[in-house]
């Protein structure tokens, strides 16, 4: 699996998940936010090649076609496949709240 | 939606799903399909601002930090959202076979 | 590399104020939190409150509230943290550290302030 | 405030052997937690964030485990430069307080 136990440990080119530590007042804007600060997101980045993680029938069509068609736009993209909660502190008035946050961390990547 | 009505009927330049034509045969080295020779398969592309049809929330939050860090390689991919069977024919021997070959044909597009 | 770099000790009087610094290089001071921190004689680690020098928000210690104020000069990369109505319990290691990903991963060497009458 | 209680509050141990710390907190703080090391007249030093990352230049043989509200810090092998005291603090919400210190 494209997760972070094998990406992190590894110098994979192709699809993959990687890390990206996010900070909710700098790169996003957000104030909201009490705790934590920031955390890690990671990011899918990487190729597609033919029978590389592919996710349906179709993108193992479209990376058998870009195989055959070097040059075309059309190609798989490698994108997040299991995503995590996270866990925040807000305020509403002077009451800290926790919420989870739904799918806010990418724990694996595919090429769909 | 960034269907194929919506997609194919405006110059879109931000995710949206397009007109691809792939011939089994050239595009794919397929020789076990008779019929379709080919297939209206489509595919996805354009980039994916904050809030261009954006599917969890962490697209969203990649988005906005795309856009707060525009160098970036961390961003949402324009992938596949809705996919539809193709019935195909092929031979075993002398006898044709009709078959339902799932997610081949792509409908929708969505940031991912 | 990243550093902070404190003022030197200060003595004060019972009920007077003292104000110290902490000048940051080698990140982007205006993007990362600002902590204080202060450490009694032979005493642990407590934490008094925080700064955000990009919008001058502020996190309190309610245990300091009404005697601490923290501002940050952006041109000098610069944070400052005042504390007000001094008392012996005051003495203490004052301590600066940059806030990142659930630490404080940097700190400056400490500037000591004693409280004598 | 959320309480940090660190366990044992002195630790001798010999060099060469393991040795592990305590941390609990007094509500969920789920991984918000990081520990640290502070030698004689010296500014404390990051060891471990979130939990259990290892911050830079932290040698291998310190590791910390836990979630929720219970944390352990450990070392694999003591050695004579790993003497000091040893501090959790967490970061769920301000104020942001220590442990006693082991």
């Known amino acids: 699996a494209l997760d972070t136990n094998y990406c992190f440990s590894s110098t994979e080119k192709n699809c993959c998940v990687r890390q990206l530590y996010i900070d909710f007042r700098k790169d996003l804007g957000w104030k909201w936010i009490h705790e934590p600060k920031g955390y890690h997101a990671n990011f899918c980045l990487g190729p597609c090649p033919y029978i590389w993680s592919l996710d349906t029938q179709y993108s193992k069509v479209l990376a058998l076609y870009n195989q055959h068609n070097p040059g075309a736009s059309a190609a798989p993209c490698c994108v997040p496949q299991a995503l995590e909660p996270l866990p925040i502190v807000y305020y509403v008035g002077r009451k800290p709240k926790v919420e989870q946050l739904s799918n806010m961390i990418v724990r694996s990547c595919k090429c769909s | 939606a960034l269907d194929t009505n919506y997609c194919f009927s405006s110059t879109e330049k931000n995710c949206c799903v397009r007109q691809l034509y792939i011939d089994f045969r050239k595009d794919l080295g397929w020789k076990w399909i008779h019929e379709p020779k080919g297939y209206h398969a489509n595919f996805c592309l354009g980039p994916c601002p904050y809030i261009w049809s954006l599917d969890t929330q962490y697209s969203k939050v990649l988005a906005l930090y795309n856009q707060h860090n525009p160098g970036a390689s961390a961003a949402p991919c324009c992938v596949p959202q809705a996919l539809e069977p193709l019935p195909i024919v092929y031979y075993v021997g002398r006898k044709p076979k009709v078959e339902q070959l799932s997610n081949m044909i792509v409908r929708s597009c969505k940031c991912s | 590399q990243v550093l902070l770099v404190q003022s030197g000790a200060e003595v004060r009087k019972p009920g007077a104020s003292v104000k110290i610094f902490c000048k940051a290089s080698?990140?982007?001071?205006?993007?990362?939190?600002m902590n204080w921190l202060r450490q009694a004689p032979e005493q642990g680690l407590e934490w008094m409150g925080q700064?955000?020098?990009?919008?001058?928000?502020?996190n309190y210690n309610g245990k300091f509230k009404g005697r601490l104020t923290l501002t940050a000069d952006t041109s000098t990369n610069t944070a400052y943290m005042e504390l007000s109505s001094l008392r012996s319990a005051d003495t203490a290691m004052y301590y600066c550290?940059?806030?990142?990903?659930?630490?404080?991963?940097?700190w400056g060497q400490g500037a000591l302030v004693t409280v004598s009458s | 405030d959320i309480v940090m209680t660190q366990t044992p509050l002195s630790l001798p141990v010999t060099p060469g052997e393991p040795a592990s710390i305590s941390c609990r907190a007094s509500?969920?703080?789920?991984?918000?937690l990081a520990w640290y090391l502070q030698k004689p007249g010296q500014s404390p030093r990051l060891l471990i964030y979130?939990?259990?990352n290892l911050a830079d230049g932290v040698p291998s043989r310190f590791s910390g485990s836990g979630s929720g509200t219970d944390f352990t810090l450990r070392i694999s092998s003591v050695e004579a430069d790993d003497v000091g005291v040893y501090y959790c603090?967490?970061?769920?919400?301000?104020?942001?307080?220590f442990g006693q210190g082991t």
């Open positions: 550290a940059r806030h990142y990903d659930g630490s404080t991963d940097y």
């Open positions: 700064i955000y020098p990009g919008d001058g928000d502020t």
């Open positions: 509500e969920n703080i789920y991984s918000n």
């Open positions: 603090q967490h970061f769920w919400g301000t104020p942001y307080t």
């Open positions: 080698g990140y982007s001071f205006t993007s990362s939190w």
């Open positions: 979130a939990a259990t």
